[in-house]
Structures are given as C-alpha cells and as structure tokens.
C-alpha cells in the first residue's frame, strides 16, 4: 500500500537569468527510492538512479545541475523555462509517486523568490 506523500516547492517564480532549485521530498514512507525522473512537460531533463547515479539530458547539461540531494538546479533561466516540472519517484516496494512544480520565469525584478530554495 502506498502511504507516502510528495512535498514540493509548489508554484515558484524566479528572475530571468537567475537560478532556482526544484525540490521534492518523499515522506511518510519507509520505501527505498530506486530512481527519480525529472521531467518538463514532454521532455526528460534528468534521471537519478540509485545504482547508476545522475544522467542529465545533453540539451540541458549546460544549465542543469544535479542536486542538492534528489533535487535539480536550473541555471541561466529564460522565459521559455516557464511551465510545469514533475518529479517522479520510483520506490520499492511502494511504486511510483509524482510531484508537480510550476515555475514562472519573470522578466523583471519583481519575482517573488522562494527563499528556502532560491540560489543567490
């Protein structure tokens, strides 16, 4: 039975040219995380497999860094980065948990920063 829950940063905003950390946290379960997929709508950004480690899509490798933890750091943000991001946690023995984050990249300096997850 799947008892866990995924906590995410929810809806976040950041400035163009800045950086942001996409973070999900799996709680309320003792299941072992075997793999985390980070996806942006129809694209696979990165995979972190417990046995293989991280693999980042070449299309994003200059702007995406693994971590901290199972999170993903997006750098040199553009307005085209605005959209939905999904963290897909594959676990044993529970199965699959999915979290959703909506990122809005703003042109001006009025972006409301999620301080806990924002990189200066």
């Amino acid at each position: 039975m799947m008892t866990g829950t995924i906590e995410t940063t929810g809806n976040i905003s950041a400035e163009k040219g800045g950086s942001i950390i996409l973070q999900c946290h799996l709680s309320s379960t003792t299941a072992q995380v075997t793999q985390v997929n980070w996806e942006q709508q129809d694209q696979l950004l990165a995979i972190c497999n417990a046995d293989l480690g991280w693999h980042i899509s070449p299309s994003f490798k200059d702007r995406v860094a693994p971590g901290p933890g199972l999170g993903l750091t997006l750098q040199s943000l553009t307005v085209n980065d605005t959209g939905e991001y999904f963290c897909i946690y594959h676990t044993y023995p529970d199965g699959t948990y999915t979290g959703r984050i909506f990122l809005e990249v703003l042109e001006s300096s009025v972006a409301e920063h999620g301080a806990r997850f924002q990189i200066p």
Partner: nanobody, 118 residues
Framework: EVQLVESGGGLVQAGGSLRLSCAAS?????????MGWFRQAPGKEREFLAI???????LYADSVKGRFTISADNAKNTVYLQMNSLKPEDTAVYYC???????????WGQGTQVTVSS
Amino acid sequence: EVQLVESGGGLVQAGGSLRLSCAASGRTFSSYAMMGWFRQAPGKEREFLAIITDGSKTLYADSVKGRFTISADNAKNTVYLQMNSLKPEDTAVYYCAAQFILARHLVWGQGTQVTVSS
C-alpha cells in the same frame, strides 16, 4: 527473477548500421522506470549511451546523440538501440539495463559484442 537478453551484435563495416535488441523475461513487474543501453570497450570504463522511460521519454549521451536511437516495444518487453554511421571507436560490448518499477535494484544483461572494422 528478471533476465535481460541482448542480441543483434556482430561485425560491421565503418559507416554501417546495427540494431540491438534487449528482451526482458521472467517477472518483469509489468512496467519499468527506465531501460537503457551502455557499452564497455576493452580497458575502458562502462559508458552510458541512452535511456528510455516507461513514458517513452529519452535521454542520450553527447557521444551518440543523432547517430543512435533508443526505442521500446512495451508489449514485447523489449528495448532497441538503432546504431547508424558506426565508427571503429564504437567497438565494445553493449549492455542493456533496466530499473523495473517494483524492483529494488537495476538488472543487467549479459552483453553483446559489436565490432566496427575500418
């Protein structure tokens, strides 16, 4: 127990093509989180090539992007690697690996030899 069996390797001339297959048999847990292809040349470390997820999203290594294509037939529990414009430096043992959704660890195949002659 799940087993992965690769096939399709062999000897090919530079510039040629090969299609590798990796079939999963046994208790495949109905779905996978990821299936991927790797290779290891003599005296070198294992190299990541390509990954496909259960949602058919793909990720490639820079070294093969544009030449190699990964695909899957979920009904047959099989993943493929189409390799075009092969070069002598592509010579290696090619392995497939799978992370099944309800499995604790990655499963590896036994490998298939690919030799590209000049």
